[in-house]
């Protein structure tokens, strides 16, 4: 899952300070104990750039190698740069490691535009900023790539969050997490807190900028506002969700349900934009025209191409519409929808035009794949992967960019009958419906 | 086939304002199609953007001008304007006005342009 | 601040000959860029937009190429219409408000 228009992004004005915080209602489920509280080492242990991914840091190796790691909640390999590369100013040396085994197989990852490939092994890895555990896990040493790592991103490797089921070579390769959680009592659960910058950052601000937080085994209450509402995970191989329906300011698309999620729709950290199937994504792009029709702009915006631009502090969100998804609830006929806002799907951009100016791309965009949850709905929620009870949950997140008037929001529950047809049923044929590329 | 003239004073006394009006003849100015532009060039150098309206009413200015312009509509007139405070006589140039076309990309269409000179 | 650089800053060609004009953006701007045409005394006139396509009435002896940082305007076989200044501009941060400094092409 990645490149492009697949990795984290930033949008639109700071967000609250924490004496504006909305009190945060009772959670009405029970928790299982430990799932809950505070992780306060955890907290703030991402970084990012705009578009260009969040990233955690890692240690590998004995004695330890520390490398910053790309969070991907949309692939399951955990793959290190392991060779000198021209954007790398870092990379795991395996020989330098006396926790090193070989597993004598190679692995080879194919992207729409890009690819790397490596050799297996497994190590010895452990989360500065996480919890206080090493674990032995299985890791792919990157020794040639193309269109991979990102000049100027400070990440030198890639954390595939996923199921097993997408791993390549092969279902046999264990993820990270699944090796974590069986060597540790560290619960099956991870929560992330995506952070827009909200404002175009320069060179020296992004370095210096906070991202969020990869919460590992629970959820943090300071991270978000209001309830958790959860989606059933539809199935373990990426995070796939069912989206029921889908609103621009409150007017319905009023497409067959199915479409939405043709061929899956997936939550992924690793895409930078709010990515939908193409009648989707056309019927999307007609209405937010038709609600912000007192400005006109390029077709080249739309695409996702050509920058935008207002003299600084102008920039006219109240144009733009909010985008509602529905996604099934955990009760039956019961959904629920999040909302974002325009600070969330337009992607502030830096070093375009002058200082006195703030330029944003569009980030929504069209997909062959399905939909995909990118950080630009990421970015307006605390996201819970709660993989031991199979669901995902968003709450409004605390970091959440946003102005006066509006506010990202996650609301429910709404009743909708027949949600189970809106998912797609994927013909099985051989290996060849398993896309990695995703650009 | 539709037609842009610029008109108003060709000269200005420094630290006034700079007046100017387009007239759209042969088309209409509430065509959703375009946005109308204008854009100066001083004697002898090269060309500088100051800023389109749609007919909405809807604006973008050049920072570099620093809020001394405002550009508005008359779609009753199928005319726009320029307003420039506070000039001096590096705003001297020749001013033209401009449909913003092609998708609302690009200047395909020009006025003559005027000469507005600023001195006392 | 995308920056557009023009090169040469004059070119001198007799009639029939080619000219090759070259504008060079400091980042790149994708396919988004325009090359107008300007004469003395009078307003410019839109050549090619979006890199490579003319604009209508635009004679087929000019033609523009390039993408991202690198465009060219070629003028297969200049006739004495064609001495004028010539400028590019780039609309990929919109709205377009980045002109280059020009090339004059003159007589020889």
């Known amino acids: 899952t990645h490149l492009g228009i697949r990795l984290p992004l930033r949008s639109g004005l700071a967000g609250p300070p924490l004496g504006l915080r909305l009190p945060r209602e009772t959670d009405e489920e029970s928790e299982e104990p430990g799932r809950r509280g505070s992780f306060v080492e955890m907290v703030d242990n991402l970084r990012g750039k705009s578009g260009q991914g969040y990233y955690v840091e890692m240690t590998v190796g004995s004695p330890p190698q520390t490398l910053n790691i790309l969070v991907d909640t949309g692939s399951s390999n955990f793959a290190v740069g392991a060779a000198p590369h021209p954007f790398l100013h870092r990379y795991y040396q395996r020989q330098l490691s006396s926790t090193y085994r070989d597993l004598r197989k190679g692995v080879y990852v194919p992207y729409t535009q890009g690819k790397w490939e490596g050799e297996l092994g497994t190590d010895l890895v452990s989360i500065p900023h996480g919890p206080n555990v090493t674990v032995r896990a299985n890791i792919a040493a990157i020794t040639e790539s193309d269109k991979f790592f990102i000049n100027g991103s400070n990440w030198e490797g890639i954390l595939g969050l996923a199921y097993a089921e997408i791993a390549r070579p092969d279902d046999s390769l264990e993820p990270f997490f699944d090796s974590l959680v069986k060597q540790t009592h560290i619960p099956n659960i991870f929560s992330l807190q995506l952070c827009g910058a909200g404002f175009p950052l320069n060179q020296t601000e992004a370095l210096a900028s906070v991202g969020g937080s990869m919460i590992i085994g629970g959820i943090d209450h300071s991270l978000y506002t209001g309830r958790l509402w959860y989606t059933p995970i539809r199935r373990e191989w990426y995070y796939e969700v069912i989206i029921v329906r889908v609103e621009i300011n409150g007017q319905d698309l009023k497409m067959d349900c199915k479409e939405y999620n043709y061929d899956k729709s997936i939550v992924d950290s690793g895409t930078t934009n709010l990515r939908l199937p193409k009648k989707v994504f056309e019927a999307a792009v007609k209405s937010i025209k038709a609600a912000s029709s007192t400005e006109k702009f390029p077709d080249g915006f739309w695409l996702g191409e050509q920058l935008v631009c207002w003299q600084a502090g102008t920039t006219p969100w109240n144009i733009f519409p909010v985008i509602s998804l529905y996604l099934m609830g955990e009760v039956t006929n019961q959904s629920f929808r999040i909302t974002i806002l325009p600070q969330q799907y337009l992607r502030p951009v830096e070093d375009v035009a002058t200082s006195q100016d703030d330029c944003y791309k569009f980030a929504v965009s069209q997909s062959s794949t399905g939909t995909v949850m990118g950080a630009v709905i990421m970015e307006g929620f605390y996201v819970v992967f709660d993989r031991a009870r199979k669901r995902i949950g968003f709450a409004v997140s605390a970091c959440h960019v946003h102005d006066e008037f509006r506010t990202a929001a996650v609301e429910g529950p709404f009743v909708t009958a027949d949600m189970e047809d809106c998912g797609y049923n994927i013909p099985q044929t051989d290996e060849s419906t398993l896309m990695t590329g995703r650009a | 086939q539709l037609q842009l003239q610029e008109s108003g004073p060709g000269l200005v006394k420094p630290s006034e304002t700079l007046s100017l009006t387009c007239t759209v003849s042969g088309g209409s100015i509430s065509s959703s199609s375009y946005y109308w532009g204008w854009i100066r060039q001083p004697p002898g150098k090269g060309l500088e953007w100051i800023g389109n309206i749609y007919y909405s009413g809807s604006t973008y200015y050049n920072p570099s001008l620093k809020g001394r312009v405002t550009i508005s509509v008359d779609t009753s007139k199928n005319q726009f304007s320029l307003k420039l405070s506070s000039v001096t006589a590096a705003d001297t140039a020749v001013y033209y006005c401009a449909r913003l076309g092609h998708g609302y990309n690009y200047f395909d269409l020009w006025g003559r342009g005027t000469l507005v000179t600023v001195s006392s | 601040e995308i920056v557009l650089t023009q090169s040469p800053a004059t070119l001198s060609l007799s009639p029939g000959e080619r000219a090759t004009l070259s504008c060079r953006a400091s980042q790149s701007v994708s396919s988004y860029l325009a090359w107008f045409q300007q004469k003395p005394g009078q307003a410019p006139r839109l050549l090619i937009y979006?890199?490579?396509n003319r604009a209508t009435g635009i004679p087929a002896r000019f033609s523009g190429s390039g993408s991202g940082t690198d465009f060219t305007l070629t003028i297969s076989s200049l006739e004495p219409e064609d001495f004028a200044v010539y400028y590019c501009q780039q609309v990929y941060v919109w709205p377009p408000r980045t002109f280059g400094g020009g090339t004059k092409v003159e007589i020889k």
């Open positions: 979006d890199a490579s």
